[in-house]
Interface confidence: low
Amino acid sequence: EDELQVIQPEKSVSVAAGESATLRCAMTSLIPVGPIMWFRGAGAGRELIYNQKEGHFPRVTTVSELTKRNNLDFSISISNITPADAGTYYCVKFRKGSPDDVEFKSGAGTELSVRAKPS
């Protein structure tokens, strides 16, 4: 396809408290150039979960090496899930811009639900 698509294959993921949640996201094209960000929620009040470009996100690890050229897999894993992490997570592609990057396209979202820790 000519135009980049952001694919979040799972509509929902259920994880037990204390476990790690893997949220999958893939791009269909390298261009336009720009970083990927993950958010919980949508709109002005959304919470930044991961920024490929900068920042420190101690609970988040990437499934593949994002700094490598040709990478189209932007899946993340969030460790030590708690009920407060429940919500819909969006993988968002930004277009390289100056001075600020511009939001280009968002995935459809993956709803994370948190089950009680097994006793």
Epitope: I31, P32, V33, K68, N70, L72, R95, K96, S98
Partner: antibody, heavy 118, light 107 residues
Framework: QVQLVQSGAEVKKPGASVKVSCKAS????????MHWVRQAPGQGLEWMGW????????NYAQKFQGRVTMTRDTSISTAYMELSRLRSDDTAVYYC???????????WGQGTLVTVSS | EIVLTQSPATLSLSPGERATITCRAS??????LAWYQQKPGQAPRLLIY???NRATGIPARFSGSGSGTDFTLTISSLEPEDFAVYYC?????????FGGGTKVEIK
């Protein structure tokens, strides 16, 4: 050093196909996208598409979709561009170009002249 | 697709003179623009990327500036080997597109 060496000039008849090769050396072939760009005689540069040598995934310019096929052979670090149903206006120099660390096209192959003539 | 318009089409100058080539994009490409040099019978060579960064091994007499829709390539003092065709290219939007080229010829 990073080098791209292309196959030699070709003369084809209208309706035929041509397959141009681009052999890479001096870097990890599967680590960088390869693009193809063509240049008609006395004209400018026209992007045709790219191939991800790692996965084999491709992305073609709309103009060439259905006529172009980009492939690769990782065992010999070579990318290929095949153009079918050739017309006289496909006469051009065809270049492969590696997508460099800064996202731009660097370096380029030396070019392959494809002449389409009856 | 993004259209890049270069001007002038031809620039006639003498060695030692300053060359200024402009590239205008049909919509903003931020700073995501490159310049290439092509000599007769040769492949293009990357000169400037991200509007103003010189590629490896490119002499300091080449400089690039601009952002948004208007960009400039400047050669501060032309050397004999600089007479060639210069192309701008954008990669912010798909598909990547090139300008029509500017020929810098000896006056």
């Amino acid at each position: 050093q990073v080098q791209l060496v292309q196959s030699g000039a070709e003369v084809k008849k209208p309706g035929a196909s041509v397959k141009v090769s681009c052999k890479a050396s001096g870097y990890t072939f599967t680590g960088y996208y390869m693009h193809w760009v063509r240049q008609a005689p006395g004209q400018g540069l026209e992007w045709m598409g790219w191939i991800n040598p790692n996965s084999g995934g491709t992305n073609y310019a709309q103009k060439f979709q259905g006529r172009v096929t980009m492939t690769r052979d990782t065992s010999i670090s070579t990318a290929y561009m095949e153009l079918s149903r050739l017309r006289s206006d496909d006469t051009a120099v065809y270049y492969c170009a590696r997508e460099g660390d800064e996202d731009w096209f660097d370096p380029w192959g030396q070019g392959t002249l494809v002449t389409v003539s009856s | 697709e993004i259209v890049l318009t270069q001007s002038p089409a031809t620039l006639s100058l003498s060695p030692g003179e300053r060359a200024t080539i402009t590239c205008r994009a049909s919509q903003s490409v931020s700073s995501y623009l490159a310049w290439y040099q092509q000599k007769p019978g040769q492949a293009p060579r990357l000169l400037i990327y991200d509007a103003s960064n010189r590629a490896t091994g490119i002499p300091a007499r080449f400089s690039g500036s601009g952002s948004g829709t208007d960009f400039t390539l400047t050669i501060s003092s032309l050397e004999p080997e600089d007479f060639a065709v210069y192309y701008c290219q954008q990669r912010l939007f798909h598909p990547p597109t090139f300008g029509g080229g500017t020929k810098v010829e000896i006056k």
